[in-house]
């Protein structure tokens, strides 16, 4: 038999033997003589390398290219393929040489004691135990164990070949541990080698190169590339590479399964590439298969080689880095080089290190950048090999947002007296200075600054109504100054003034200073304070047995140490107001009374409770108030009245009333009382519900119905009730005329 | 461009033999697992066989197992089908297509096998 | 061998609106991966069959966005909107859980 694709100049070597199946003895020399047109070699069985003792290929006396092979007393296992071919060709000749021993029927490899065979449990699969023969017409059985079953050819799936063993479903002997095949001669039964029986999947999960990326070498080089199919279990793996070079003298590839962990779901396996030394034409894309017959998955990594070791800097590097007071800088090192290069980083010359506030490598990265990083950077990259130097120099610019200085000094409120004259100041550091300060006012009162609202504690106030100072009416009267240049503490500062001509009105100002980078803002809250003030809650008159409290309340930043005291019997004048200062003079004339002191951000408010007002609790009650800064005592005085409790009266009288059908009734209920009563309306007892033709107003003092209907007609009540009692009125309302149906109903 | 191409159908007697031919281009044939998948005259698409990339690993329908010999020769860029002992059933139009992660993402564009006495 | 079953005929559909294709498995094909092993196929009349659609819901290189899987473990559908006349042929879902790959019969798109 012949292979290989005939050549225009060569013809196929020749055997002596022209047979394709040879059966001989076992014991007897086989011979074999080929010839042919160039150098030739052998290939036979159990050994593709020449190095079998028993086997002998000499030259042939009689002429060139002409090698005989000889194998004395050949025994069972010289059976099979033995191959003539020319070397670094195709075109070989081909002799199946059967070797009959009935003493040993099955060829067994040379060096298995034991052999594996490959499985999946499915039924389509079939298996083929590689139990060849060394005679050709055996009757072969196949035995699986454990438990013990044998398997005999039947014409269809299960068969036996000498030359390629015994094909079974896989299915039927994917329950067994090992398999062997036996043979009859003569009723002595023969047996192969066991084979263990390992189940197969088929699915790959992944195919994993390391490297993975960025493969870099240089000319003389070994590159080893490892590329790791993950399976799932039972699987068997066809790996394959494709690389630039193909043709590689020095290329190896081994490829082995890796020892995965007991109880692992997952099988790995590895083929590593190696090239020994690298050429420029081994650079390219190497592309690593693995393949299981129904799945093929496929990974690729660039492998790079360079001439020589070298470095260079990327045409993305930055000269010049711009950044804001506070960011996290990052400047990249973009360089070309192989190996990868040492990299130093300077600051005006000084080496950098690394510490919490700085990182430096393929990276400078300035965790919080400040003022004082601005400078130039430079940075040095050294070829490891060549000692190649490269360096470029960055230039780090940092902005600064617009800070206002007094902002960290001012407390969240500032006192005015009322009437005079005063100015405020904002000082704006920023880089770039500021290309503007606007100037902005609010009222005070339009503008609550209440802890639950605040937005900072910069800017505690939540106010958004800002009106440019321009606009000053309802405010203060306003001047802006221009802006001035000052060096204050090293630093070049924009200083904007405000002049507020009188402090009338208790307003917010603020300042507002933008640059490129940013905007800050400085709010002011102009207080502008008098004397303590007195208010009562609820602010109606009490009656007696209701509670009221008299609330004092006192700029904090103005006056300090609040205290209630209530005048005796004498008389007193009736207006609010500050007292005379004997009264204020003369405190230990007063009583001193208990009460319970509040702040806000603004004011402390002394509240005196007086739980179920008496009318001995009527008179003249004292707020005194102390200045901060004066320590002069300021005082203010309330009368407080209590109303006598009275039952509910109603004064007037509900009337009989005779209506026409679709006419308008309107009737009064007036009622007093001390607390003041409710009202309510009944109709016939029962309680009166509004609709669209029945308006009760005024506290349910004036009802009115409307296109008055025949079931209006009835008894109505108006009752006046509080805790003290009710008083009642009755009224029958009589209504005339016959009912019209309407689209309006 | 991927391309492929088969060849080798004919008309066969039931019993008879006959060698399906796929010849591959426009891709590196031994980076991809390989397939034969048959559409019946009446539009059914059948899985037939599969085969690895270096060849050592082949799978079969149930129907065609013990019968059909999928192989492939690597350096000619060719897939091949030995098809034996032919049934009628197995009359269709044999595609062969190219694998990756399972999916069959190139097919040819087929060939026809009748068997019928 | 796990089934798939598809209707022989979609609802005629006019060009410009949008069709589904059902496809029902025997079998979950949710595999322990977390992907779902389901592709679909058009083979267009006159051609061989082209991948469209892999693992449920990825679209195959150059498919048009028109084009679009969903399902669950054994429900699939694949969704076609904006109908073109190129669209017309069979469509095929086939499942690569479990070995043998099984196609389903098929579902003809007819145009009104």
């Known amino acids: 038999a012949s292979v290989g694709l005939p050549s225009v100049s060569l013809d196929l070597p020749r055997l002596s033997i022209q047979k394709d199946i040879l059966t001989i003895k076992a014991n007897t020399t086989l011979q074999i003589t080929c010839r042919g047109q160039r150098d030739l070699d052998w290939l036979w069985p159990n050994n593709q390398s020449g190095s079998e003792q028993r086997v002998e290929v000499t030259e042939c006396s009689d002429g060139l290219f002409c090698k005989t092979l000889t194998i004395p007393k050949v025994i069972g296992n010289d059976t099979g393929a033995y191959k003539c071919f020319y070397r670094e060709t195709d075109l070989a000749s081909v002799i199946y040489v059967y070797v009959q021993d009935y003493r040993s029927p099955f060829i067994a490899s040379v060096s298995d004691q034991h052999g594996v065979v490959y499985i999946t449990e499915n039924k389509n699969k079939t298996v083929v135990i590689p139990c060849l023969g060394s005679i050709s017409n055996l009757n072969v059985s196949l035995c699986a164990r454990y438990p013990e079953k044998r398997f005999v050819p039947d014409g269809n799936r299960i068969s036996w070949d000498s030359k390629k063993g015994f094909t079974i479903p896989s299915y039927m002997i994917s329950y067994a541990g090992m398999v062997f095949c036996e043979a009859k001669i003569n009723d002595e039964s023969y047996q192969s080698i066991m084979y263990i029986v390992v189940v197969v999947g088929y699915r790959i999960y992944d195919v994993v190169l390391s490297p993975s990326h960025g493969v870099e070498l240089s000319v003389g080089e070994k590159l080893v590339l490892n590329c790791t199919a993950r399976t799932e279990l039972n699987v068997g793996i066809d790996f394959n590479w494709e690389y630039p070079s193909s043709k590689h003298q020095h290329k190896k590839l081994v490829n082995r399964d890796l020892k995965t962990q007991s109880g692992s779901e997952m099988k790995k396996f590895l083929s590593t590439l190696t090239i020994d030394g690298v050429t420029r034409s081994d650079q390219g894309l190497y592309t690593c298969a693995a393949s299981s017959g129904l799945m093929t998955k496929k990974n690729s990594t660039f492998v790079r080689v360079h001439e020589k070791p070298f470095v260079a800097f990327g045409s993305g590097m930055e000269s010049l880095v711009e950044a804001t007071v506070g960011e996290r800088v990052r400047i990249p090192v973009k360089y070309l080089g192989y190996p990868p290069p040492e990299i130093k980083w300077y600051k005006n010359g000084i080496p950098l290190e690394s510490n919490h506030t700085v990182k430096v490598g393929h990276v400078l990265t300035i965790m919080e950048v400040s003022e004082r990083d601005t400078g130039n950077y430079t940075v040095i990259l050294t070829n490891p090999i060549s000692k190649e130097k490269q360096s470029h120099v960055v230039s780090l610019v940092v902005y600064v947002p617009p800070q206002i200085g007094e902002k960290s000094l001012i407390s969240p409120v500032d006192s005015y007296q009322y009437g005079t004259t005063q100015t405020l100041t904002c000082t704006v550091y920023a880089i770039p200075p500021p290309h503007h300060i606007h100037w902005y006012w609010q009222l005070e009162e339009e503008c609550p600054n209440e802890p639950s609202q605040a937005v900072s504690v910069t800017n505690p106030y939540p106010c958004e109504e800002w009106r440019s100072v321009e606009d000053f009416q309802g405010g203060n009267k306003i001047e802006v100054n221009k802006n001035q240049f000052a060096l204050i503490e090293g630093k070049n500062k924009t200083v904007s003034t405000l002049v507020i001509q009188a402090a009338n009105v208790s307003a917010l100002y603020k300042c507002e200073a933008v640059n490129k980078v940013g905007r800050g803002e400085r709010v002011i809250s102009f207080h502008v304070t008098r004397g303590p003030e007195i208010t009562l809650q609820p602010d109606l008159q009490p009656t007696e047995q209701e509670s009221v409290s008299l609330w004092c309340t006192a700029d904090k930043s103005t006056f300090e140490n609040l205290t209630w005291y209530k005048l005796g019997p004498q008389p007193l004048p009736v207006h609010v107001g500050e007292l005379p200062t004997p009264v204020c003079k003369n405190l230990d004339t007063l009583w001193k009374l208990n009460a319970t002191i509040f702040s806000n951000s603004t004011n402390d408010i002394l509240i005196m409770e007086l739980k179920n007002a008496s009318l001995q609790d009527q008179g003249d009650y004292v707020c005194v108030a102390q200045d901060r800064k004066t320590k002069k005592r300021h005082c203010v005085v309330r009368q407080l009245t209590v109303l006598e409790r009275v039952a509910p009266m109603i004064t007037g009288n509900l009337e009989n009333q005779t209506t026409s059908i679709g006419e308008t009734i309107e009737v009064s209920c007036t009622a007093s009382g001390n607390p003041p009563p409710q009202i309510m309306w009944f109709k016939d007892n029962e309680t009166l519900v509004e609709d669209s033709g029945i308006v009760l107003k005024d506290g349910n003092r004036n009802l009115t119905i409307r296109r008055v209907r025949k079931e209006d007609e009835g008894l109505y009540t108006c009752q006046a009730c509080s805790v003290l009692g009710c008083a009642k009125v009755e009224a029958f309302f009589i209504i005339e005329g016959a009912q019209e149906k309407t689209n309006l109903e | 461009e991927v391309q492929l191409v088969e060849s080798g159908g004919d008309l066969v007697k039931p019993g008879g033999s006959l060698k399906l031919s796929c010849a591959a281009s426009?891709?590196?044939?031994?980076?991809?697992?390989m397939s034969w998948v048959r559409q019946t005259p009446d539009k059914r698409l059948e899985w037939v066989a599969s085969?690895?990339?270096?060849?050592?690993?082949?799978y079969y329908a149930d129907s065609v197992e013990g019968r059909f010999i999928i192989s492939r020769e690597n350096a000619k860029n060719t897939l091949f089908l030995q098809m034996n002992s032919l049934k009628s059933e197995d009359t269709a139009l044999y595609y062969c297509a190219r694998e990756l992660d399972g999916n069959y993402d190139y097919w040819g564009q087929g060939t026809t096998l009748t068997v019928s006495s | 061998h796990i089934m798939i079953t598809q209707d022989e005929l979609s609802n005629p559909v006019t060009f410009g609106e949008s069709v589904s294709i059902s496809c029902r498995s025997s079998?979950?094909?949710?595999?322990?991966?977390?992907?779902?092993?389901l592709n679909w196929f058009l083979q267009r009349p006159g051609q061989s069959p082209q991948l469209l659609i892999y693992?449920?819901?990825t679209r195959a290189s150059g498919v048009s966005d028109r084009f679009s899987g969903s399902g669950s473990g054994t429900d699939f559908t694949l969704e076609i909107s904006r109908v073109k006349a190129e669209d017309v042929g069979i469509y095929y879902c086939?499942?690569?859980?479990?070995?043998?790959?099984?196609f389903g019969s098929g579902t003809k798109l007819e145009i009104k």
């Open positions: 426009g891709f590196t044939f031994s980076m991809y697992g």
């Open positions: 693992l449920m819901s």
């Open positions: 086939q499942q690569l859980v479990e070995y043998p790959f099984t």
């Open positions: 079998k979950s094909l949710l595999y322990k991966d977390g992907k779902t092993y």
């Open positions: 085969i690895s990339i270096g060849g050592s690993y082949t």
